[in-house]
């Protein structure tokens, strides 16, 4: 599914993203944008042997299982292929233990490079929320 | 226990196309990403790409990019590679296996033979 | 692409022997190689996975060494069941790739 950008926001809104640790919902939001361009199915191979998934792009070399990346911690304790559901309750739940880790939203290399101290309220202004 | 059935031989004229399936029973489906070999004599094994039925999402082989097609069915657990514009330089073993970095999981293999 | 040569493409082996195959990679691939067996019109069998683990159900005659870009599948003690080829193939990156083969006969 490839999310509308307010109807992303709604949905992350719902499942508690809204100022979850600190971050305000534009961050997020913006965070899916660079990551995943709102695309809950999209998958990135990185040089390392693993693999990025869904949304927000999350690692199967630490959080999830993808059954093929070696050394893998599976920290949300979920196999990968749930990141890519058009529900994005699976993929909300992770990065909540991602963004609970201790680098924030530094974890996502798309929001350090791309919504880190940028006007992030732009992504959610104009949304019925 | 984990098992991958792929289709029967097929022999197929050059220019034509085949769908080759790969049925998977023992495990969930959706979540192991399904990887295509080929395997020709005195060419070795090599690797044609990959699908992630759960999600649709595909990976090729540079050298395969225009040849082969993936698709997934998840309601019947099956995996498809399409061939096309079909010529004797396809004319090989075609595997389905489980990607898991390594291949535990292998269907039995394809034998495609294109001619005239 | 990375590239995986294998020595020698032919052994000739006596039941009882022991023997080493070799697989070279063209760039360092830390220990993401597996090794399998494959018997005519048969599927390739996995032996050995991450260089030296051995796969459920694998005599431990077979081993796995080798890190980085040179590795070494040994089988102590060769049975007449082990002949056949063997194929490495690596997981460090796509696309994934295999080696050309060494062929196990008897002598």
């Known amino acids: 599914k490839v999310f509308g950008r307010c109807e992303l926001a709604a949905a992350m809104k719902r499942h508690g993203l809204d100022n979850y640790r600190g971050y305000s919902l534009g961050n997020w939001v913006c965070a899916a944008k660079f990551e995943s361009n709102f695309n809950t199915q999209a998958t990135n191979r990185n040089t390392d042997g693993s693999t990025d998934y869904g949304i927000l792009q999350i690692n199967s070399r630490w959080w999830c299982n993808d059954g093929r990346t070696p050394g893998s911690r599976n920290l949300c304790n979920i196999p990968c292929s749930a990141l890519l559901s058009s529900d994005i309750t699976a993929s909300v739940n992770c990065a909540k233990k991602i963004v609970s880790d201790g680098n924030g939203m530094n974890a996502w290399v798309a929001w350090r490079n791309r919504c880190k101290g940028t006007d992030v309220q732009a992504w959610i202004r104009g949304c019925r929320l | 226990q984990v098992q991958l059935q792929e289709s029967g031989a097929e022999v197929m004229k050059p220019g034509a196309s085949v769908k080759i399936s790969c049925k998977a029973t023992?495990?969930?489906?959706?979540?192991?990403?399904i990887e295509w070999v080929k395997q020709r004599p005195g060419h070795g094994l090599e690797w044609i790409g990959e699908?992630?039925?759960?999600?649709?999402?595909?990976y090729y082989n540079e050298k395969f990019k225009g040849k082969a097609t993936f698709t997934a069915d998840t309601s019947s657990n099956t995996a498809y590679m399409q061939l096309s514009s079909l010529t004797s330089e396809d004319s090989a073993v075609y595997y389905c296996?489980?990607?898991?970095?390594?291949?535990?999981?292998w269907g039995q293999g394809t034998t495609l033979t294109v001619s005239s | 692409d990375i590239e995986l040569t294998q020595s020698p493409a032919t052994l000739s082996v006596t039941p009882g022997d022991s023997v080493s195959l070799s697989c070279r990679a063209s760039?360092?691939?830390?220990?993401?190689l597996h090794w399998y067996q494959q018997k005519s019109h048969e599927s390739p069998r996995l032996l050995i996975k991450?260089?030296?683990q051995r796969a459920s159900g694998i005599p431990s005659r077979f081993s796995g060494s080798g890190s980085g870009t040179d590795f070494t599948l040994s089988i102590n003690s060769v049975e007449t069941e082990d002949f056949g080829m063997y194929f490495c193939?690596?997981?460090?990156?796509?696309?994934?790739?295999f080696g050309g083969g060494t062929k196990l006969e008897i002598k």
């Open positions: 023992g495990y969930t489906f959706t979540t192991y990403w």
């Open positions: 760039q360092s691939i830390s220990n993401n």
């Open positions: 296996a489980r990607g898991d970095g390594f291949y535990y999981y």
């Open positions: 991450y260089a030296s």
């Open positions: 699908i992630l039925p759960g999600s649709g999402s595909t």
């Open positions: 193939q690596q997981s460090n990156s796509w696309p994934r790739t």
